[in-house]
């Protein structure tokens, strides 16, 4: 509770608290916290958890107060709530507090994980689902394939993860993902560890000459969720093996980039 004098919810309904440009920002950005009351108020207060006194006051005879946080630092991140009051209320009486707003001030968001679902081995013809999992909701998730400039797939998700489906026959390759805030100014996560998808039994010795690094044949554009690698027509796969990439030298096997661009 913010103060001992907070009345019942029905008495003075809670205000709404929002942040501009976003609730996740990089250090140095100017952030405006907007507190909107359901009725004209006289004083607005911005509170942090466990503090009786407001962090900031705004005396405005309207339904909206703005609290300016200039060039925010990570220390200014955390949970905020706002309340409002009117002059005809008793001393120290505030409205119900707004829902919490969590402000995150960070240079980069935590690294997501990239895993294959439902399991590590996928039979021929089956689709492969890759899950890019971060820690924050309402982010945009981006799936990249090594050797392709533009992202392979892009998802906005209300959950802290996004699932990307790859067509089984077109799946072999090396993948990584990011997530970032859904609108500018963007805050970016670290890149995930890479995930290699390869045909079961395939290794340096099984790799067809036609798919040497840098060699590309005609194929779908990079926006195709199943941008495919050069044809393995003479190879009969039993299933797909999905594995985290281990450190390797340039001479060791690395999936050829997909034939993603007509002009490459």
């Amino acid at each position: 509770d913010i103060t001992p004098s907070v009345p019942p919810a029905s008495y003075h309904p809670k205000p709404w608290l929002g942040a501009q440009p976003a609730t996740v920002v990089t250090p140095g950005v100017n952030v405006t916290l907007r507190c909107r009351a359901p009725q004209p108020a006289w004083r607005f207060g911005l509170f942090k958890p466990g503090e009786i006194a407001p962090l900031l006051f705004r005396d405005v005879s309207s339904e909206l107060a703005e609290f300016f946080l200039e060039e925010v630092t990570p220390a200014q991140g955390g949970i905020y709530r706002c309340c409002y009051r009117r002059p005809d209320w008793g001393p120290g009486v505030w409205s119900q507090p707004s829902d919490v707003l969590e402000l995150l001030v960070t240079e980069e968001l935590p690294r997501p994980s990239l895993v294959a679902l439902p399991g590590p081995v996928v039979g021929p013809g089956a689709n492969v689902s890759l899950r890019c999992a971060g820690r924050l909701r309402n982010m945009s998730f981006v799936l990249y394939r090594e050797g392709v400039a533009a992202p392979l797939q892009y998802r906005h998700s209300a959950q802290p993860w996004a699932d990307f489906t790859l067509l089984g026959a077109r799946a072999p390759g090396t993948y990584s993902c990011y997530y970032h805030t859904p609108s500018a100014p963007y805050v970016l996560s670290q890149r995930s560890e890479v995930l290699v998808i390869s045909w079961e039994g395939e290794g340096p010795e099984a790799r067809p000459a036609s798919s040497a690094p840098g060699m590309q044949a005609p194929g779908p554009p990079p926006s195709d969720p199943g941008a495919q690698a050069p044809s393995l027509s003479s190879f009969r796969p039993r299933g797909l093996v999905l594995q985290p990439l281990l450190p390797q030298t340039q001479d060791s096997w690395d999936p050829a980039p997909p034939p993603s661009d007509p002009g490459v």
Partner: antibody
């Protein structure tokens, strides 16, 4: 803050090789692809290629495939580019740049290479 | 390879003037995966490395003044400076960020009268 510090200017003879460095700081080196771009005096920009430091995967512009070799050292957060069989055409400023999902958002100050006998 | 063609090659303007420059690509740069155009604009001042102005054809990089606006889709793109300032003297490059090899336009040099 993010910084890409490139090694100093190089003067080399035709036929020789040079290896330049790009030391990254202020970010997680293995989370970003490192690109290299060439700019000849008074000319435009040419993309050479990139390296993914976390896997050592490289992608080259075909034009530079036999000219440039990209490597990276995770332990020192440093990307390298070696240019071989130098000719006067290789006299240029070479930039390293960090690649985010949006653009090449941070660039080194450039390494000037002069090839002269 | 995707060829990027910029015009004009140079522009001489007075401070406060509105400027537009064009960039055309030989192939569409629209990524159907997220409906974004993978076209980036860079500004390069003398003796400095390039600096990102606009990515995804129209998204302004953080810290870039709002007088810079990118527009266009597919193969035709435009960079507009609403009111040119003395510090905008530079060469402006567009870049294909859609497919490898990444390719740059030849640049538009902005000069002040």
């Amino acid at each position: 803050q993010v910084q890409l510090q490139q090694s100093g200017a190089e003067l080399a003879k035709p036929g020789a090789s040079v290896k330049m460095s790009c030391k990254a700081s202020g970010f997680t080196f293995t989370s970003y692809w490192m690109h290299w771009v060439k700019q000849r005096p008074g000319q435009g920009l040419e993309w050479i290629g990139y390296i993914n430091p976390s896997t050592d995967y490289t992608e080259y512009n075909q034009k530079f495939k036999d000219k440039a070799t990209l490597t990276a050292d995770k332990s020192s957060s440093t990307a390298y580019m070696q240019l071989s069989s130098l000719t006067s055409e290789d006299s240029a400023v070479y930039y390293c740049a960090r690649r985010s999902p949006f653009a090449m958002d941070y660039w080194g100050q450039g390494t000037s290479v002069t090839v002269s006998s | 390879d995707i060829v990027m063609t910029q015009s004009p090659s140079s522009l001489t303007v007075t401070a406060g003037e509105k400027v537009t420059m064009s960039c055309k690509s030989s192939q569409s740069l629209l990524n159907s995966g997220n409906q974004k155009n993978y076209l980036t604009w860079y500004q390069q001042k003398p003796g400095q490395p390039p600096k990102v102005l606009i990515y995804w054809a129209s998204t302004r990089e953080s810290g870039v003044p709002d007088r810079f606006t990118g527009s266009g889709s597919g193969t035709d793109f435009t960079l507009t400076i609403s009111s040119v300032q003395a510090e905008d003297l530079a060469v402006y490059y567009c870049q294909n960020d859609y497919s490898y090899p990444l390719t740059f336009g030849t640049g538009t040099k902005l000069e002040l009268k």
